[in-house]
């Protein structure tokens, strides 16, 4: 049978020919009668055999990491007969490892983020090196990790490559660290190969700094003319943290928050001082407020860094503005009777300069030919007033500072013209009526009514009478209905068209004013032939036709 031991060849042998071992048949008595042959993978190119002795040699440098085993076949032939002495057999040549590969970090680049102020022992990252050498061959691929750079803040576990924090770090002092890790094979023994990697460790921010005002005093100014909501200046606190941890909120201490407010601009982290209530230089020309600042987000466990809020004092100076005159009232309403003579007193308006210099004021009434105003604000009539033409005047009074005519104020002035009884009542329309020749006594021929242009405090009441002449010698009479109307009645039987075709009746109408006014109004009454029907309609129709120039049969 075949006789051999297991074959090993060390990798990376530089000799031109390296003896591996011997293949032989136990029938071989050493007299060179047998011929040994090598077949299969690498036969002739990588491995050769001494045909006489069966000694096997490697004739090429081998790399275990490239190929670690070769399966070959061996034959032994009797030279004399040319026949196989043993059956063809497979055998294996294993390439044995040497420590020719350094550890390599395959997952580079390494980068880790860890919160600042993390306690000792906090895991940062694990780095892993791999070694192409045979892990089953001694310590060729057994690695030890060590820290070349990064003390005293970091440490590495020698066998796992786990990097941990060994000392608290403050991001505000240094926000990133380069750590250099070395991996050595042979568990660090002499002859070990090594590889290194760099790890960038970034510290993430925690809210361990409160915002602090860099200035203990801010001086701001505000114009007294500034409207509410006006931004009058900014204040700024600084927070060494970043991002969300540097977001802050400004506020005013409660006692000082009547006139001013502070809002936070979350983009710039500035405090904007705004006017909450209008200021008046003449009333108060300076203010002092205390502002405070706090972080927007503070986790409970970090409250120890935020016990007392930083404060600053803000002095605000009010700037004087030349303000227009100020009227005592927002508007004025005066009353004056109609028909009062020119120059009659209407009322007094008053405006003052709110500024400290107290400029004299000049007044004027815009667009009015009816009223005058003097420098004292006294308003008088410049024309006689007639309520029946205009009962109200809507005017505008302007006050102008004498020393600065650009400072003007205007307010409304309403003048009501009060009524006096200066109009007598009169017919509400022109009355012309008809009476038939054959009309009987007491026949109603017209109802009349009156109007009065005056305004009545109570209801108007009119009194109707015939004039003295008509009362004494009248074919007609009047009855007052007591409702501001009256009726005209015939006072006799029968009228004669030829003798007296028209009657003109004078009617007196008096009002209930004080003093009472009376007017005389003429009622025209036509006499007409009404026919048998006695209808005034017919009479009206006939008269109408006649008046139009038509002849009737």
């Amino acid at each position: 049978g075949w006789v051999w031991n297991q074959f090993f060849v060390p990798e990376e042998m530089n000799t031109t020919s390296h003896h591996i071992g011997q293949l032989r048949s136990d029938l071989d008595n050493g007299n060179n009668s047998f011929q040994y042959k090598l077949l299969g993978a690498g036969a002739g190119s990588t491995f050769i055999i001494d045909e006489r002795t069966g000694d096997i040699y490697a004739i090429q440098k081998l790399d275990r990491e490239e190929r670690s085993l070769y399966i070959l076949r061996a034959q032994v032939i009797d030279i004399a007969t040319g026949r196989a002495v043993e059956p063809e057999s497979e055998f294996v040549i294993k390439v044995s490892d040497i420590n020719d590969n350094e550890p390599k970090f395959l997952d580079e680049p390494y980068e880790a983020i860890v919160p600042e102020m993390s306690p000792e022992g906090t895991l940062v990252i694990q780095v892993t090196a791999s070694d192409a050498d045979d892990p089953s061959s001694g310590n060729n691929a057994r690695l030890l990790y060590s820290l070349l750079q990064g003390q005293p803040y970091f440490s590495v576990e020698p066998t796992t490559g786990v990097i941990r924090i060994s000392s608290k770090m403050d991001r505000e002092l240094q926000d990133e660290y380069w750590v250099i890790i070395q991996a050595k094979d042979m568990i660090g023994q002499p002859g070990a190969l090594s590889g290194t990697t760099s790890v960038l460790i970034k510290l993430s921010d925690v809210n361990d700094n409160k915002p602090i005002f860099k200035e203990s005093l801010y001086r701001l100014t505000v114009s007294e003319s500034a409207p509410t909501g006006t931004s009058i200046g900014t204040i700024m606190a600084y927070d060494n943290d970043i991002g969300e941890n540097a977001e802050m909120d400004y506020s005013i201490e409660e006692d000082d928050s009547q006139t001013f407010d502070i809002i936070t601009n979350h983009e710039t982290q500035e405090g904007i001082v705004i006017l909450k209530k209008k200021v008046d230089f003449e009333h108060q020309n300076h203010y002092g407020i205390r502002a405070k600042v706090k972080n927007h987000h503070v986790p409970e466990q970090l409250m120890k860094y935020h016990t007392e809020a930083s404060t600053t004092f803000i002095k605000i100076q009010v700037e004087d503005v030349d303000e227009p005159p100020l009227f005592l009232l927002p508007y004025y309403v005066f009353e004056v009777f109609e028909e009062t003579p020119q120059g009659s007193f209407v009322g007094v308006v008053s405006a003052t300069d709110p500024d400290n210099r107290k400029s004299p004021i000049r007044y004027s009434i815009t667009r009015s030919k009816v009223f005058n105003i003097n420098d004292n604000g006294t308003i008088t009539t410049s024309n006689s007033l007639d309520r029946e033409i205009s009962a109200w005047y809507n005017l505008s009074i302007t006050a102008t500072e004498k020393y600065n005519i650009e400072q003007i104020s205007s307010i409304p002035l309403y003048v009501q013209v009060l009524n006096i009884n200066d109009h007598a009542p009169e017919f509400s329309q022109y009355y012309e009526t008809y009476v038939c020749e054959n009309a009987g006594s007491g026949q109603v021929i017209q109802t009349i009514s009156a109007v009065d242009r005056d305004e009545s405090i109570e209801e108007h009441h009119f009194y109707f009478n015939l004039s003295v002449e008509d009362t004494n010698n009248s074919s007609f009479t009047i009855i007052d209905n007591q409702d501001n109307t009256a009726v005209i009645l015939t006072n006799r039987t029968g009228f004669n068209l030829q003798e007296e075709p028209v009657f003109y009746i004078s009617i007196l109408i008096a009002d209930n004013g004080i003093p009472s006014l009376t007017s005389t109004n003429t009622l025209t009454i036509h006499v007409c032939d009404c026919g048998d029907s006695g209808s005034t309609q017919t009479c009206q129709y006939q008269e109408l036709v006649l008046s139009m120039g038509f002849k009737t049969e």
Partner: antibody, heavy 120, light 108 residues
């Protein structure tokens, strides 16, 4: 898992050099124990091994093509390449790249292949 | 150079039948160095068997390989519709690596 992808021109003029690249993804070309191989298949015919390379640069070629073949590796790009010079119409084939287990010699996995036509 | 001869060139069978494919080497090949591949039209070959008899990952157990020396066999115990393809053997024993000419298994 490891995947391979061939790339290169689909048409090459006669007498010119055919150049293909195989990009390896899902694993490192620098892993020990593997060869990175090129195989071709003439239309309607069988498979022909061209050669392979170890990532450290050692090459093994089919003697029938050795004079015209160069296989190279770029570990930084995780790629290996084939150059076949002085091509003729007989080099028209689908070219595959594949990973070879160095100890036992089987091909797995393979790229999907790219057809290269040699024509003027 | 080791020449691998595959037979038959074409095998016409019905689904469910048994397929036996032969690969003969021109000289002895270590069984550790013989592999079988399946190739479907328009696709790359796929490893089925390595070391003459070991199934690759994900290969159904209806595929089996055997043989040594110069004679190797691939058996498909019960043909499924997706098994109709071309099958190649390949050796790594002696350089250059070589493939057989292939056996086409087609539907009868």
């Amino acid at each position: 898992q490891v995947q391979l992808q061939e790339s290169g021109p689909g048409l090459v003029r006669p007498s010119q050099t055919l150049s293909l690249t195989c990009t390896v993804s899902g694993g490192s070309i620098s892993s020990g124990g593997y060869y990175w191989s090129w195989i071709r298949q003439h239309p309607g015919k069988g498979l022909e091994w061209i050669g392979y390379i170890y990532y450290r640069g050692r090459t093994y070629y089919n003697p029938s093509l050795k004079s015209r073949v160069t296989i190279s590796v770029d570990t930084s790009k995780n790629q290996f390449s084939l150059k076949l010079s002085s091509v003729t119409a007989a080099d028209t084939a689908v070219y595959y790249c594949a990973r070879v287990y160095s100890n036992y010699g089987w091909f797995d996995p393979w790229g999907q292949g790219t057809l290269v036509t040699v024509s003027s | 150079e080791i020449v691998l001869t595959q037979s038959p060139g074409t095998l016409s069978l019905s689904p469910g039948e048994r397929a036996t494919l032969s690969c003969r080497a021109s000289q002895s090949v270590s069984s550790s160095y013989l592999a079988w591949y399946q190739q479907k039209p328009g696709q790359a070959p796929r490893l089925l068997i390595y070391g003459a008899s070991s199934r690759a990952t994900g290969i159904p157990d209806r595929f089996s390989g055997s043989g040594s020396g110069t004679d190797f066999t691939l058996t498909i115990s019960r043909l499924e519709p997706e098994d109709f393809a071309v099958y190649y053997c390949q050796q790594y024993d002696t350089s250059p690596l070589t493939f057989g000419g292939g056996t086409k298994v087609e539907i009868k």
